[in-house]
Interface confidence: low
């Protein structure tokens, strides 16, 4: 059953004398493996014998016998799916039909393949896109219906006989569907390639020529133009004539329209290949070109720059930058339309010519206030001198100048006065808008530049002001020199360094912290009595009577200041001791008698000792000696001794008389 055999292979294979042929082939015999294979050349079926007659190129049978010519023809297949064949070399008389006689255990099949062998290598075929336009990338394809593993070939591209430098991509196909070699070349043709010959050349492995195919390029392109001008340098003066001619060097397809453009804009009613400009004006200066169109699009010539020369036009000045800050750099640029360009410039400042300034630019590296004003210029070229334009204004800004702080008060200023200061300046640009004062006080700071200090303090030393526009300029500080009475007056003991004892040499100093003016007088006072007029009060030998409350006064031309009262304390041993008796120095027996030791001492007496008429100390140590009841035997002279930290003092004798009571006298 023939339907059981399925074959796939190229229908026809192409080669040439001496080359080789590789036949890719697959099959499927559904009833089992292949047992016999014979390759016939031009097989014919013999009805008598029920077999195929023809030249046997290859034979593979069950017993494995192989004909001797089978070295040229090789069966590269297998027993169940591959039926690939190779003939190497292939000859002209191999052309015709190849018959593959296949036999399995139960089935037989004859498969036919066409082989076309030419005498010489056949040419490849170049394929071009339907239309080629300049600068658009196209792919050129060269196709050859041949490929064989045993016979390497190459395809090379030539343009006008010269190898093309673009890299080509070569691919081969040896499949059951197709057998070919293909070369593809990507190429961006220019208008100049129009009409040129492209060749695809088939070569063997050694680069030997085998065959070729050629095509002529038809490159569609916009018109290619050349422009010519009279005069050739395109430099004229106002009133001259100019002629421009447009020539088409190439166009595919033919051109259809012509126009002229100036600075990219079409000139009306100019549709011929010649442009005549009569009595030109400077406005006609510019870039001219001609434009010619075809079906591809418009083509433009190179531009011709027509220069109509004229004397400089009235100039303007550009300032970089105004307003300018004092000390900064400023550049002035003289701008004047002229052709040819100005060769010389004259500069003016406030109408006066600036000497030595002949360039297009004037650079002032360090601007000062006097540079302010109007700047103008005049430009000059070979055709004449331009007019001076309106000029430009340079505004020079700077901080306030020569700022001073001025005291408006009559001098001297006294503590407590109201002081008025003003902030003055010489000049300022822009105007002064505010003022600042140092140090900052509790006073109000009006913006008018006048400062009022109510009740000025003795310690307001210096004041400085600043006048401010965009910047602040500070004046040097001014001294208020406020005058005031002596301050912080106090009494200070200079000697002795320790406590004052009676008899010591004592010095008191009248101190003060400051005084303005410095010239001062001193006064010492005790209990409202003037003691001295020096800064020191001296006692050669102090006595307890000198103790008391002392004050010193310091005065200057502004006023006088007193110290706080200072207490002078003199330490001395107990003195002026005496024994007083209560109720008296005569007491009746049985009554009570109190003896008191009175004394003057600083510090007070801390310890008392009592003595009798025999100078015998009594066992009593308080200030009072109480005798109760008093006896006659107590009569006699008593004295006391007082002790403090400085020393001791004793009293004179005081006599106590104790007399008998009437009862005692009655008993006797």
């Amino acid at each position: 059953d023939s339907s059981k055999w399925v074959f796939e292979h190229p229908e026809t294979l192409y080669a040439w004398e001496g080359a080789c042929v590789w036949i890719p082939c697959t099959y499927r015999a559904l009833d089992g493996d292949l047992e016999s294979f014979i390759l016939f050349h031009n097989p014919e079926y013999n009805k008598n014998t029920s077999k195929f007659d023809g030249t046997r190129l290859y034979e593979s049978t069950k017993d494995g016998k192989v004909p001797s010519e089978q070295k040229r023809v090789q069966f590269l297949g297998d027993k169940n799916k591959n039926c690939t064949l190779s003939i190497h070399p292939v000859h002209l008389n191999d052309s015709g039909q190849l018959g593959l006689r296949m036999e399995s255990k139960t089935e037989k099949w004859m498969e036919r393949i066409h082989l076309n062998v030419s005498e010489r290598p056949f040419p490849p075929h170049i394929q071009l896109p339907p239309e080629i336009q300049e600068s658009q990338e196209v792919t050129l394809t060269c196709l050859l219906n041949f490929s064989c593993y045993g016979y390497p070939i190459q395809l090379q591209w030539l343009l006008e006989g010269v190898p093309m430098r673009q890299a080509a991509v070569t691919s081969t196909s040896l499949t059951i569907k197709s057998v070919f070699t293909r070369s593809e070349l990507k190429f961006s043709p220019q208008w100049s390639h129009h009409g040129k010959i492209v060749t695809c050349q088939l070569q063997d492995a050694d680069g030997k020529f085998l065959s070729n195919d050629t095509v002529q390029l038809n490159v569609k392109h916009t018109p290619k133009l050349e422009i010519k001008v009279t005069p050739s340098d395109a430099i004229v003066r106002e009133g001259d004539s100019v002629t421009m001619t447009c020539e088409v060097s190439s166009s595919n397809p033919e051109y259809t329209t012509v126009s002229w453009l100036k600075d990219g804009t079409s000139l009306k009613k100019q549709n011929t290949f010649t442009l005549n400009l009569r009595e030109v004006t400077k406005d006609q200066s510019g870039k001219y070109c001609c434009q010619v169109s075809n079906d591809v699009g418009p083509g433009r010539s190179e531009e011709v720059f027509l220069q109509v020369q004229y004397a400089p036009e009235p100039s303007t000045v550009q300032i970089l930058h105004s307003p300018a800050v004092e000390g900064s750099q400023v550049e002035f640029l003289c701008m004047s339309l002229a052709n040819p360009l100005p060769t010389n410039y004259t500069w003016y400042h406030n109408g006066k010519e600036m000497q030595g300034r002949t360039e297009e630019k004037v650079h002032i590296p360090k601007i000062l206030p006097w540079h302010a004003g109007t700047y103008s210029c005049v430009a000059e070229n070979i055709l004449g001198t331009g007019q001076r334009g309106p000029g430009a204004e340079l505004d020079v800004q700077y901080p306030p100048k020569k700022v001073t702080t001025v005291i408006q008060n009559p001098m001297p200023i006294r503590e407590g006065d109201t002081v008025t200061l003003s902030c003055n300046y010489n000049s300022s640009n822009p105007s002064v808008t505010r003022y600042e004062w140092k140090p900052h006080g509790a006073w109000e700071e009006p913006s008018l530049g006048v400062l009022k200090i109510q009740n000025v303090g003795w310690d307001n030393t210096t004041i400085a002001c600043a006048a401010c526009n965009s910047w602040c300029s500070w004046a040097s500080p001014v001294a208020l020199n406020v005058q005031y009475a002596p301050r912080d007056v106090r009494v200070r003991k200079i000697k002795p360094l320790s406590e004052i004892h009676s008899g010591n040499s004592v010095s008191l100093q009248c101190d003060f912290s400051s005084s303005h003016p410095k010239e001062v007088q001193f006064f010492w006072e005790k209990n409202g009595r003037l003691l001295g007029k020096e800064s020191q009060l001296n006692f050669d030998s102090i006595s307890p009577e000198d103790a008391g409350s002392y004050s010193c006064w310091v005065n200057n031309s502004i006023g006088q200041t007193a110290s706080k009262a200072w207490t002078l304390e003199v330490l001395y041993a107990p003195r002026r001791l005496r024994v007083s008796m209560s109720p008296g120095d005569q007491v009746m027996e049985g009554k009570s008698a109190t003896l008191t030791c009175e004394s003057d001492a600083n510090p007070p007496v801390s310890h008392y000792t009592w003595f009798d008429w025999n100078n015998q100390s009594l066992p009593y140590h308080s200030q009072k000696l109480r005798l109760e009841p008093v006896k006659v035997q107590h009569s006699g002279a008593y004295w006391c001794q007082g002790t403090n930290s400085v020393g001791k003092g004793r009293s004179p004798l005081s006599t106590l008389t104790v007399y008998y009571s009437p009862e005692t006298i009655g008993r006797r």
């Epitope: 340098d233 395109a234 430099i235 870039k287 011709v304 720059f305 220069q307 040819p340 360009l341 100005p342 060769t343």
Partner: nanobody, 121 residues
Framework: QVQLVESGGGLVQAGDSLKLSCLAS????????MSWFRQAPGKEREFVAG????????HHADSVKGRFTISRDNAKSAVYLQMNSLQPEDTAVYFC??????????????WGQGTQVTVSS
Amino acid sequence: QVQLVESGGGLVQAGDSLKLSCLASGITFSSYYMSWFRQAPGKEREFVAGVGRSGAPSHHADSVKGRFTISRDNAKSAVYLQMNSLQPEDTAVYFCAAKWMAASTTVADYWGQGTQVTVSS
């Protein structure tokens, strides 16, 4: 197409001289104001000198005045820069430029590729 090709650059000692040339092709040379610019590493391109279409007037940047001189030869489509008393701060790539207007801005119609000038101390 338009080409501006500079030459003449190289390595010199401070105080030496060099002459740069720029050959133009593909343009009507006499229709263009020709300039030299330079660009030092890490800095912007700056104007050095320029010359009018007929060879006058010429303009020079303040930094090169008295040391560099620009000139042109319209017959040879060439512009030159004679550089004397070269200083290390003149080290840069020097570019030739063709332009319609004579402003000293870094805008030009056509530029060259540049030539390196190195001045060692």
